[in-house]
């Protein structure tokens, strides 16, 4: 089929349109979808194409991270004339096609959301057989996963000169604020480390020097809730060891 220079328009709905007088491919995806961890989310994606009444083999694909090269998280294939898109790949069994690709709908449902699912997703359709064509959303849809705080680690570690320090790591979205409380502390934010690269939802707070025995409590809070965990420090006085 004829290919001419493209005219690209994109609006706030992330409608990606590439048109020419003879044909029109377009994909409609929202910029962002938000959902809470543990819940399900729907990633909408619909498309139009220039191949009138196409009923040949097709493959629907969703990938994560980046267009064209990101890892596939879902793939299904429909045989010639079939309305059924048979799932060939569903990462961890959590991805399910809601739409009907034969009706230009690639919408995807993601079950049991986790913070690790917070990334950009790209829908793609491939026609095979007599018509040989393909199209992928270039901007994709951002899945924004929110979560109440959860303390993933709390520990007491030795420091130089027989001292001790406490570390508290929590995850959540928005990233939680951390506070320590304990003997002679009151409430302290105590050296909060910003989220680490590649671990965008993790926040760590350190108490650099534990001066008193007793119970130290870390509290993590964001707009969705709060969580706390405690660690106990008992030093054997006159010895260099400690019990936690």
């Amino acid at each position: 089929f004829v290919r001419t220079k493209i005219d690209t328009t994109e609006n706030l709905l992330n409608t990606e349109v590439h048109s020419s007088p003879a044909q029109r491919w377009s994909m409609q995806v929202p910029p962002e979808v938000s959902a809470e961890a543990g819940d399900a989310a729907v990633l909408p994606c619909t498309f139009t194409h220039p191949h009138r009444h196409y009923d040949g083999p097709l493959t629907a694909i969703w990938r994560a991270g980046e267009p064209y090269a990101g890892p596939q998280v879902f793939r299904c294939a429909a045989a010639r004339g079939s309305e059924l898109c048979q799932t060939a790949l569903s990462l961890h069994g959590r991805f399910r096609l809601l739409g009907n690709p034969r009706r230009n709908d690639l919408s995807l449902r993601v079950e049991r959301l986790a913070l690790a699912d917070d990334r950009r997703y790209f829908c793609r359709v491939e026609f095979a057989g007599d018509v040989h064509d393909r199209y992928e959303s270039r901007h994709g849809v951002r899945l924004h996963v929110t979560a109440a705080p959860r303390i993933v680690n709390i520990s007491v570690l030795p420091s130089p000169a027989h001292a001790f320090r406490a570390l508290c790591t929590a995850e959540g979205e928005p990233p939680p604020a951390l506070a320590w409380s304990g003997p002679a502390l009151g409430n302290s934010l105590a050296a909060v480390r910003s989220p680490r690269e590649g671990h965008g939802h993790l926040v760590t707070a350190e108490l650099p020097a534990l001066t008193h025995d007793g119970r130290y409590t870390c509290t993590a809070a964001n707009s969705l809730g709060r969580s706390e965990a405690s660690v106990y420090l008992f030093r054997f006085h006159g010895a260099s060891g400690a019990s936690t």
Epitope: R3, A88, A128, Y135
Partner: antibody, heavy 118, light 112 residues
Framework: EVQVVESDGGFVQPGRSLKLSCAAS????????MAWVRQAPTKGLEWVAA????????YYRDSVMGRFTISRDNAQNTLYLQMDSLRSEDTATYYC???????????WGQGTLVTVSS | GIVMTQAPLSVSVTPGESASISCRSS???????????VFWYLQKPGKSPQLLIY???NLASGVPDRFSGSGSETDFTLKISRMEAEDVGIYYC?????????FGSGTKLEIK
């Protein structure tokens, strides 16, 4: 590290058959189309066949259609090329390659020589 | 099928000098998505081909940035900005827009 390794080719008489295999590693095999590309001695590259992710769709160049069959075993990360009714003009080094629509033939095997002669 | 025509057939380049190789397709390789489905490969003597450029102008992983690709819908150019001894070999353009997928006949690049 991505690797594609072809099985040994060999010497075969015209009209006979030969099956090539290609073991892939270092990437999610089922996420990609795969293809065979050949190169006759002192000649250029010639695409032979391609196969979709799940083996549902296959493509062939006209000169091998009906004689060659491309297939794959995703559980074993292996690509195959069954060559029947071989002709002298099929003599070439056969390369197994990962076919990425937007990324090209990004990874190639070392090639295996198939000689068709009486 | 789409015919890919390369020029010149061979070229000799002095080390440090630049070289350009041309490729023309019999049909536009610009897809309506905006992607141009042309690719460049290098086959060094006695070796398998390797991908240099994908989607007309994108440098493949591990390829030195002295290589660059450009072009329009049907006319494409591979440029090597500073020729090195390791760049000798046969350069092929290829298309993945339509079946059958085709390559150019190759351009042999030698050191002067």
């Amino acid at each position: 590290e991505v690797q594609v390794v072809e099985s040994d080719g060999g010497f075969v008489q015209p009209g006979r058959s030969l099956k090539l295999s290609c073991a892939a590693s270092g990437f999610t095999f089922s996420d990609y189309y795969m293809a065979w590309v050949r190169q006759a001695p002192t000649k250029g590259l010639e695409w032979v066949a391609a196969i979709s992710y799940d083996g549902i769709t296959t493509y062939y160049r006209d000169s091998v259609m009906g004689r060659f069959t491309i297939s794959r075993d995703n559980a074993q990360n292996t690509l195959y090329l069954q060559m029947d009714s071989l002709r002298s003009e099929d003599t070439a080094t056969y390369y197994c390659t990962r076919h990425d629509w937007e990324g090209g033939f990004a990874y190639w095997g070392q090639g295996t020589l198939v000689t068709v002669s009486s | 099928g789409i015919v890919m025509t390369q020029a010149p057939l061979s070229v000799s380049v002095t080390p440090g000098e630049s070289a350009s190789i041309s490729c023309r397709s019999s049909k536009s390789l610009l897809h309506s998505s905006g992607i141009t489905y042309v690719f460049w490969y290098l086959q060094k003597p006695g070796k398998s081909p390797q991908l240099l450029i994908y989607r007309m102008s994108n440098l493949a992983s591990g390829v030195p940035d002295r290589f660059s690709g450009s072009g329009s819908e049907t006319d494409f150019t591979l440029k090597i900005s500073r020729m090195e001894a390791e760049d000798v070999g046969i350069y092929y353009c290829g298309q993945l827009l339509e079946n059958p997928f085709t390559f150019g006949s190759g351009t042999k690049l030698e050191i002067k």
